[in-house]
């Protein structure tokens, strides 16, 4: 890995190498300055593997609301607007980090958690299983 | 919003409502128990809107490595294996939370940061702009 020279102005901590419990400032800094979120908002409908977004809410998690994609069909939409079952719609998934309140219901104590979310769908050529 | 009854066993904190600085345990709990990540690992190649994955590394961020998808073509792959420019490959983007070391180079002090990442690509019907 890359060794980072330690900043002498860091808060005190017992473990100087890789901390297990750290301080996190929840004032979110948003780096997404050059993007137009509206541009991608209709892809779910225009895609050949369209999807719907479902709201997943959990007050014990931060962020408490996550949107999950579910592919509408097993096949993909062809040029005529019909579902073509020679192709497969599949979810594109990503592991993301969230904060889980620990102990439960605590406002200022969390644990990092990895969850798998489905972000959208893509159309793929099926895997052909050859029977011997 | 949902009011959560406060757990009496919570660590002390000055702000009882919505903390700006919290304690986070970095021992990651992985909730992805029922998934097989290998199943989706070849979608980038089998998709009609294939993509390449680029490694984005930043030692001041946690996680330090994030993989970014970049669509291979402007169009989509048709049944003959050629690029069809009557359709568009577009990135599916998602806002994710990461931890940014703050002050810089500190091992135990972070700030939450939102970044936009491209997870994969999907094939969409183009928006047709009619000229008056």
């Amino acid at each position: 890995g890359i060794t980072i020279p330690r900043n002498p102005g860091c808060p005190n901590s017992e473990d100087k190498n890789f901390p297990r419990t750290v301080m996190v400032n929840l004032n979110i800094h948003n780096r997404n300055t050059n993007t137009n979120p509206k541009r991608s908002s209709d892809y779910y409908n225009r895609s050949t593997s369209p999807w719907n977004l479902h709201r997943n809410e959990d007050p014990e998690r931060y962020p408490s609301v996550i949107w999950e994609a579910k592919c509408r069909h097993l096949g993909c939409i062809n040029a005529d607007g019909n579902v073509d079952y020679h192709m497969n719609s599949v979810p594109i998934q990503q592991e993301i980090l969230v904060l889980r309140r620990e102990p439960p219901h605590c406002p200022n104590s969390f644990r990092l958690e990895k969850i798998l979310v489905s972000v959208g769908c893509t159309c793929v050529t099926p895997i052909v299983h050859h029977v011997a | 919003g949902i009011t959560i009854p406060r757990n009496p066993g919570c660590p002390n904190s000055e702000d009882k409502n919505f903390p700006r600085t919290v304690m986070v345990n970095l021992n990651i709990h992985n909730r992805n128990t029922n998934t097989n990540p290998k199943r989706s690992s070849d979608y980038y190649n089998r998709s009609t809107s294939p993509w390449n994955l680029h490694r984005n590394e930043d030692p001041e961020r946690y996680p330090s490595v994030i993989w970014e998808a970049k669509c291979r073509h402007l169009g989509c792959i048709n049944a003959d294996g050629n690029v069809d420019y009557h359709m568009n490959s577009v990135p599916i983007q998602q806002e994710i939370l990461v931890l940014r070391r703050e002050p810089p180079h500190c091992p135990n002090s972070f700030r939450l940061e939102k970044i936009l990442v491209s997870v994969g690509c999907t094939c969409v019907t183009p928006i047709v702009h009619h000229v008056a």
Epitope: N45, H54, C71, H73, L74, I127 | -
Partner: antibody, heavy 124, light 113 residues
Amino acid sequence: QVQLQESGPGLVKPSETLSLTCTVSGFSLPSHSVSWIRQPPGKGLEWIGIIWNNGGTDYNSAFKSRVTISVDTSKNQFSLKLSSVTAADTAVYYCARNMYITDYYYENYFLDAWGQGTLVTVSS
Amino acid sequence: DIVMTQSPLSLPVTPGEPASISCKSSQSLLFSENQKNYLAWYLQKPGQSPQLLIYWTSTRQSGVPDRFSGSGSGTDFTLKISRVEAEDVGVYYCQQSYYTPYTFGQGTKVEIK
């Protein structure tokens, strides 16, 4: 508990539009999709169409040109409209909830809760 | 449209005895990406609306007794009742949810001998 209740006129004249309402309770509309199914007297079940949680629809192509499914979230109501009806549209019409499975990344077309059904007769 | 063919169309049964219903699809219901078969079974009791018994070929819906079991893959599927009870009478339907429109079998009427 989960409940779905169909309502509407029991008699419709040929060439007119059949209009039915499905009032639901006991589940979250933003999570679940709802389908309409019909059953002609003494016959089997026929899927008419679905309205997804976001208001999008998908119809059986046999009905496509004359069916409309919509939702009024504020009233917890779904509606079915079938235009230009004939005697062949006489049936018991059901609304049913599409199953929602967490950690499953496709819309689900299994129907895990049904209304009691309403008989619509097309006759002059 | 996918044709779902059930047999038999009528099944007289004796309480306590096993029963079996077959359902054949005109196309495979096995999705290669997740190896799931998109087939469900419903029971419509006399004067009632249908109720979901089994989905994905063999997963029992919550509250369904374990005497009901489903099996099969591809185009051939079976619903078995290990020991028929009087309350099991009605019409059983299979349904495919792979291809739109989502179609049902013509139904199998189970009645007590």
